[in-house]
């Protein structure tokens, strides 16, 4: 049964299609394949901590060590990538903190995406000094294993020199790599010695070999690409938001809720209210009022702005986010002070995340 009663004919179901949002990411921990990763559960006063990955209970095994508030992953692999949560169970409540683990190399092989520094890779030689091909920047080629999420862009580089200037060609799994071998083809930037594949899919997995050659010799280098697939997951709310706030009577205040969701999120701001002088209905459930929700007629639903507040506006404000997979909520408190007291952002008081978990 629902854990609330609604007042003023409001509904917690979406009445209008949700609007599109610029979604913010949860904290992301990145590790290269083979590295060890240690994450501390950022929750206080935890009697018992339980861990999940993509919603499934996580127990210790030969690579996963759970000690107190620490999670250790030894010899990380792309399969360790995903949405993790630690839940602190206390005597009166429980609290959950989310983070992402991404076991991946950088998008490009040791380089920025924009290739602005690529010119120095194109080495001109004195025409008299004939020379077989050689690598000019092996640092950019050190990471051979690239594990990237589906839909990302991948760039492999093989900066080389030689005289005459070598040519470069690419093989996939030892065979000539043709444009028709992948939807959308690929780009080769000869002046930057790079291969670029946009919006990778699992069929792009494999070994990519650059072959650099001139009449005096040939060299090659192989990269391994692994494409990490994703599964749909419920919304994640940034820890600590919305934050507790205080203002004087007549002042303005803003609550912010940062949402991360693959799927279309529906955002609601809810407040505990009184009806006929009571905070609870006959069924013992609290009365709640939907103040704002995402929809056609709603401006940025991640922000709840209150203007010219009165003492009646004091209380708990809940940011509740749902998508077709599940939901999450967190709350903050508004303190309304008499006019003679100076208002201040309550930085020292952190909102207790009120996840529906």
């Amino acid at each position: 049964r629902p854990s609330f009663s609604l007042v003023e004919d409001t509904t917690l179901e979406p009445e209008e299609p949700p609007t599109k949002y610029q979604i913010s990411q949860p904290e992301v921990y990145v590790a290269a394949p083979g590295e060890s990763l240690e994450v501390r559960c950022l929750l206080k006063d935890a009697a018992v901590i339980s861990w999940t990955k993509d919603g499934v209970h996580l127990g210790p095994n030969n690579r996963t060590v759970l000690i107190g508030e620490y999670l250790q992953i030894k010899g990380a692999t792309p399969r360790d990538s995903g949405l993790y949560a630690c839940t602190a169970s206390r005597t009166v409540d429980s609290e959950t903190w989310y983070f992402m683990v991404n076991v991946t190399d950088a998008i490009s092989s040791g380089d920025d995406e924009d290739d602005t520094d690529g010119a120095e890779d194109f080495v001109s030689e004195n025409s008299n000094n004939k020379r077989a091909p050689y690598w000019t920047n092996t640092e950019k080629m050190e990471k051979r294993l690239h594990a990237v999420p589906a839909a990302n862009t991948v760039k492999f580089r093989c900066p080389a020199g030689g005289n005459p200037m070598p040519t470069m060609r690419w093989l996939k799994n030892g065979k000539e790599f043709k444009q028709e071998h992948r939807i959308g083809g690929y780009k080769v930037r000869n002046q930057h010695w790079s291969l670029i594949m946009e919006s990778v899919v699992p069929s792009d997995k494999g070994n990519y070999t650059c072959v650099v050659e001139n009449e005096y010799g040939s060299i090659n280098h192989t990269y391994h690409l692994d494409v990490v697939e994703r599964s749909p997951h419920r919304p994640i709310l940034q820890a600590g938001l919305p934050a507790n706030a205080s203002t004087v009577v007549g002042g303005d205040v803003e609550f912010v809720c940062k949402v991360y969701s693959d799927a279309q999120p529906h955002i609601q701001w809810i407040k505990h209210v009184e009806k006929n002088g009571s905070k609870y209905g006959p069924d013992g459930l609290p009365y709640l009022k939907v103040l704002k929700h995402s929809g056609i007629n709603s401006s940025n639903a991640e922000v709840l702005a209150l203007f010219n507040v009165t003492e009646a506006d004091a209380g708990e404000y809940i940011c509740k986010v749902s998508n077709y997979i599940g939901q999450a909520n967190q709350s903050a408190w508004l303190t309304v002070l008499p006019k003679q007291q100076a208002p201040g952002r309550e930085k020292e008081i952190t909102a207790s995340p009120d996840y529906l978990e």
């Epitope: 179901e13 299609p17 949700p18 999940t52 499934v56 209970h57 799927a263 998508n323 077709y324 529906l356």
Partner: antibody, heavy 114, light 107 residues
Framework: EVQLQQSGAELVKPGASVKMSCKAS????????VHWVRQTPGQGLEWIGL????????SYNQKFKAKATLTADKSSSAAYMQLSSLTSEDSAVYYC???????WGQGTSLTVSS | DIVMTQSHKFMSTSVGDRVNITCKAS??????VAWYQQKPGQSPKLLIY???YRYSGVPDRFTGSGSGTDFTFTISSVQAEDLAVYYC?????????FGGGTKLEMK
Amino acid sequence: EVQLQQSGAELVKPGASVKMSCKASGYTFSFYNVHWVRQTPGQGLEWIGLIYPDNGDTSYNQKFKAKATLTADKSSSAAYMQLSSLTSEDSAVYYCARGGFDYWGQGTSLTVSS
Amino acid sequence: DIVMTQSHKFMSTSVGDRVNITCKASQDVSTAVAWYQQKPGQSPKLLIYSASYRYSGVPDRFTGSGSGTDFTFTISSVQAEDLAVYYCQQHYSTPYTFGGGTKLEMK
């Protein structure tokens, strides 16, 4: 391994009610919606509604609001759908599915016949 | 309610063929579209979600594309085991609605 195990086939008389179950295992039940979907030869797949087990929040397809009641029991990781005032038009296969529609139960066949 | 229309109820194909199944939404659903495969006597199986994300374990011959109102599901090289009914679904807003299905048959 994630699994959704649904209760067995039902044969009921018109006007009666029926309550079918969907028992979840292999994941944190509270973390995901449970959807209910009806399949008939004539109408194809129809979404009935969802329940979020952690707090009991529900969302219904208006078409089924008077017909279906969704509940969930966190302690047993089970979701339930009760269908009332049954008619022959309610004869169908009813599926439960996890939040992302990534795992489905095997379906419960309901036959309404006098 | 958002109506999802799959214009072809049946499509004939041969092993090795490339097949495109289309789905049109009655209003903008962004990229909130999923594709399912259903074989006789089985439950639907998720293949693609959010228009283009292949679900874990789904063979890479299955791809999805599109946004707004027009969506395409592609099988790059049909295998015998791909003969089934394919449904699109919008998960943009409730009630989540399905297309009528496209049955893939052998020529």
